[in-house]
Amino acid sequence: VPLSRTVRCTCISISNQPVNPRSLEKLEIIPASQFCPRVEIIATMKKKGEKRCLNPESKAIKNLLKAVSKERSKRSP
């Protein structure tokens, strides 16, 4: 999905559907700021580097974030 190149909110749509962590290249959490009043979560997929915007209010996305951070903490020494 294309992302805005402005200093406003980045996402065009936000999805409640979690992505498969194995398909994930990178997960960015952009905190709310003076430019965008919302937290935005951008998932970069391994396939073609596609970016997907995820809904931070969604239960499924919150669970995904927990799973990813748990996986990261396992990997860090």
């Epitope: 065009i12 999805s15 596609e50 809904n55």
Partner: antibody, heavy 117, light 110 residues
């Protein structure tokens, strides 16, 4: 189920204005970008504009930039297209469509705009 | 701006396979969607993200891509598949993202 219903089409004189609306239901409207796409009689699809889920970003095709304005009202689940300085070549069936992060996954049935000179 | 090129028409006999191509510079780097539009109807999404199918779309519809061409394949073509087919991508190469459609391909079932 997802429903998109366009309205506001009709006959307009060249140089005049027209406002199209799209009533959305069956999904969380405030989570999704929305598009306007048109199709001239016997021709292909032409993308016109998109507005982000919260209305903070709007992008337009060069053919309508400066003449058309896309807007939304998330409290009423409504998408709008304000068209001004209409030309004969704007005659088309106008569709609203829901963005799904790449694809346009649901479309309305369209509203016909005829511009007479 | 980005251009997608489709053949104006493709003809196929019932039960045979139809292939509709969509050419674009390095289209393999982009996510491609395909829409079916029957006469007098709104477009219907049949393939998204190159090769995924929305629920309710038969397995006969599939998508694939190479570096400069995306392909919609319809196997065991039926009379009801006769329609116009459009490919679509997002182009983010300019200063603002925009949606680009191919010119459309009319599929005729002989």
């Amino acid at each position: 189920q997802v429903q998109l219903v366009e309205s506001g089409g009709g006959v307009a004189h060249s140089g005049k204005s027209l406002r199209l609306s799209c009533a959305a239901s069956g999904f969380t409207f405030s989570n999704y970008g929305m598009h306007w796409v048109r199709q001239a009689p016997g021709k292909g699809l032409e993308w016109l504009a998109v507005i982000s889920y919260d209305g903070s970003n709007r992008y337009y095709a060069d053919s309508v930039k400066g003449r058309f304005t896309i807007s939304r009202d998330n409290s009423n689940n409504t998408l709008n297209l304000q068209m001004s300085s209409l030309r004969a070549e704007d005659t088309a069936l106008y569709y609203c469509a829901k963005d799904a992060g790449g694809p346009l996954d649901y479309w309305g049935r369209g509203t016909l705009v005829t511009v007479s000179s | 701006s980005y251009v997608l090129t489709q053949p104006p028409s493709v003809s196929v006999a019932p039960g045979q396979m139809a292939r509709i191509t969509c050419g674009g510079n390095n289209i393999g780097d982009k996510s491609v969607q395909w829409y079916q539009q029957r006469p007098g109807q709104a477009p219907l999404l049949v393939v998204y993200d190159d090769s995924d199918r929305p629920s309710g779309i038969p397995e006969r519809f599939s998508g694939s891509y190479s570096r400069n061409t995306a392909t919609l394949t319809i196997s065991r073509v039926e009379a009801g598949d006769e329609a116009d087919y459009y490919c679509q991508v997002w182009d983010s190469s300019s200063d603002h993202p925009e949606v680009v459609f191919g010119g459309g391909t009319k599929l005729t079932v002989l």
